[in-house]
């Protein structure tokens, strides 16, 4: 008789990241008997939901069910049927929904209610949909990358699992850039965290971590662009905005009503003598950089030192993983290599922004124009945020590692969120048998 393979004793988990610009579904898998070991959970699937972020379904929540169908059906296919009922599903909404809730709690609640109802229709163990705080978003991103880098493991390895991994147990800081917010999270060196709102204490695998985190709402790349436009149109002499953050020859008409739709531009709102204006790109990195810096208020700091807008930031310490839009933008610009210095990045950005729009469109024919047009702004914004916002220098730039995936799992808050909610990161170091790591080391 033929030998039958024993059924794989594995578990699955699903997390939906409901971001400001889109929703992504992640499926994670791990060996059931090694739940408490570090580094055993890995991502087996990412499904990007077609369409915008869930906050855009305001007043048309009836469309949410259809919106989620494809990716939820994909999860049904990937996860064995016998596991469906035991597979937890979590949805976390981030800054897009935080902004919606600021404007209307009722609208935000309606969206979440319908999301919950839609997800409850699937055969999985739905655990709820909620808007996570900026602090959680930062913390879970930090947990994710350090878990995947093996930083919580007490066993030192003689080999490195990723090119930028150092063999010490110093954790990496986490830099996350979304469409509507950005997070900075790291363990400062023997530094008191002066503002309690920015302090987190963790005990993970028997070790204590005092972590600094802050989420800057409205400073994700999309909302930062709206802020910049709202600021710059204030001083425009007519309905033409000559914008250094767009390529020469680029033109786009913007509705003033769209500009002022987001709470992020409220501080710049004024009555304008026109209902539309035209962006005309002039493609000048230096001027774009200067314009972006005006979004950061560095004149006021009630602490020993600040990032911007009066927010405490301790001195930077150690290596940082920069992920999400930090990675996607820099990857597009071909600037993720460890060997590229900050000066070189700046040089390349100057050249890129100065390229005529027609030339850019030809060079990147496969890229949607909406996204393509914003890479000059986004790249410049990343440099401005990291250098002037977070005080990285030309020297400390080499400590920033632009990370898309680690060990096949996306860097981001979703894995950390699931690990926490499924209690898979113990406070104490689990007692392991001599062979407990043998199957995956």
């Amino acid at each position: 008789t033929q030998n039958k393979a024993l059924p794989e004793n594995v578990k699955y988990g699903i997390v939906l990241d409901a971001g400001s610009s889109h929703t992504s579904l992640y499926i994670y898998k791990w060996p059931a008997e090694k739940e408490n070991d570090t580094g055993v959970v890995h991502q087996v699937e990412e499904c990007r939901v077609k369409g915008p972020g869930i906050s855009k379904f305001v007043q048309k929540v009836n469309e949410i069910g259809i919106y989620l169908t494809d990716c939820m059906e994909r999860a049904r296919e990937v996860i064995p049927r016998s596991q469906h009922q035991e597979t937890p599903v979590y949805l976390g909404a981030t800054a897009g929904m935080r902004l919606l809730r600021m404007e209307s709690e009722e609208l935000a609640d309606r969206v979440l209610d319908v999301v919950e109802r839609s997800l409850s229709n699937y055969p999985f163990d739905f655990q709820g949909a909620r808007i996570i705080t900026g602090q959680e978003e930062g913390a879970y991103g930090w947990i994710t990358i350090n878990y995947l880098l093996g930083k919580f493991s007490q066993k030192t390895r003689w080999f490195s699992i990723v090119p930028y991994e150092t063999n010490n147990q110093e954790t990496f800081g986490a830099l996350d850039l979304g469409g509507a917010s950005t997070q900075v999270t790291f363990v400062p060196q023997n530094q008191t965290i002066e503002s309690p709102d920015n302090a987190l204490q963790f005990r993970l695998y028997g070790k204590d971590y005092n972590v600094y985190t802050h989420s800057f709402l409205c400073y994700g790349k999309d909302q930062a662009l709206w802020q910049k436009l709202a600021k710059d149109i204030q001083v425009a002499s007519n309905e033409i905005l000559r914008d250094p953050c767009f390529h020469p020859g680029y033109k786009k008409v913007v509705n003033v009503s769209d500009l002022y739709k987001t709470p992020c531009t409220k501080r710049f709102e004024m009555t304008l003598p026109f209902q539309q204006f035209e962006i005309q790109g002039i493609g000048n990195y230096q001027q774009c950089h200067q314009s972006i810096l005006e979004l950061f208020n560095t004149s006021y700091c009630p602490y020993s030192q600040c990032a911007f807008n009066g927010i405490f930031l301790p001195p930077l310490q150690g290596d940082f993983g920069a992920f999400s839009a930090f990675y996607f933008v820099m990857k597009f610009l071909n600037l993720t290599s460890e060997k590229v210095s900050q000066e070189k990045v700046t040089e390349m950005m100057k050249k890129f922004c100065a390229q005529p729009w027609e030339e850019i469109k030809t060079s990147y024919a496969g890229v949607k124009e909406k996204y393509l047009s914003e890479y000059c702004f986004s790249g410049t914004y990343i440099l401005s945020l990291l250098l002037q916002g977070y005080h990285f220098t030309a020297d400390s730039w080499e400590h920033i590692h632009f990370i898309g995936k680690i060990q096949g799992s996306d860097a981001g808050w979703t894995l950390g969120y699931m690990l926490n909610l499924t209690n898979m990161i113990p406070a104490e170091q689990p007692l392991s048998t001599p062979l407990s790591h043998s199957t995956y080391v």
Epitope: K56, V58, Q59, K60, V61, N62, E103, S104, E106, L107, R110, D113, V114, R117, N255, S257, D258, K261
Partner: antibody, heavy 123, light 107 residues
């Protein structure tokens, strides 16, 4: 109490433009979309489309694409319907109707209606 | 487009009667049907939503039923103030469409 108050009757010539207002009170304007409905004399109701009062995004029924425009003045809790290049067949009463929210399974219904604005197009 | 057919254009009734107005959808609309009452010179008023849910303040003599393609509005004890046009409406998919209307008249 909740009210939708529309602007008064209009007498227009073919080719002209008319702009009808619908002022909402008694509720949070951005929490509910606004529908527009046409009723020609002695005829039934025809849905023209709706505007998302939170995002400002309009949705038009096929028969009302082109000459018709929905807009908002959120600070004044007011929705507008503009009809350009008026034709005789635009003679009708136009209603604004709130897109009320009623939860699962169908979510929406037109729960509050304006009193209607009569538009007469005649040369 | 989904066509909503109200086959009876007019219905003659008497006070105290039980009146049933029917509406047929050209395709399945689930329970996404509303009923409106319109009196001469007035705007429509919502009576029933989601096929069978009575709107706030609507007298309980008005009842909605049906799902899929066949829907009924029933007035169990006809009153003189119920003389009006009645429209069904589907909002299962765009464009939203109304029935042609049924006018209730006194015999």
């Amino acid at each position: 109490q909740i009210q939708l108050v529309q602007s008064g009757p209009e007498l227009k010539k073919p080719g002209e433009t008319v702009k009808i207002s619908c002022e909402a009170s008694g509720y949070t304007f951005i929490n509910y979309g606004m529908n527009w409905v046409k009723q020609a004399p002695g005829k039934g109701l025809k849905w023209m489309g709706w505007i998302n009062t939170y995002t400002g995004e309009p949705t038009y029924a096929d028969d009302f694409k082109g000459r018709f425009a929905f807009s908002l003045e959120t600070s004044a809790n007011t929705a507008y319907l503009q009809i350009n290049n008026l034709k005789n067949e635009d003679t009708a009463t136009y209603f604004c109707a709130r897109k009320g929210y009623y939860g699962y399974p169908n979510y929406y219904a037109m729960d509050y209606w304006g009193q209607g604005t009569s538009v007469t197009v005649s040369s | 487009d989904i066509v909503m057919t109200q086959s009876q254009k007019f219905m003659s009734t008497s006070v105290g009667d039980r009146v049933s107005i029917t509406c047929k959808a050209s395709q399945n609309v689930g329970t996404a049907v509303a009923w409106y009452q319109q009196k001469p010179g007035q705007s429509p008023k919502l009576l029933i939503y989601s096929a069978s849910n009575r709107y706030t303040g609507v007298p309980d003599r008005f009842t909605g039923s049906g799902s899929g393609t066949d829907f009924t509005l029933t007035i169990s004890n006809m009153q003189s103030e119920d003389l009006a046009d009645y429209f069904c409406q589907q909002y299962s998919s765009y464009p939203i469409t109304f029935g042609t209307g049924t006018k209730l008249e006194i015999k």
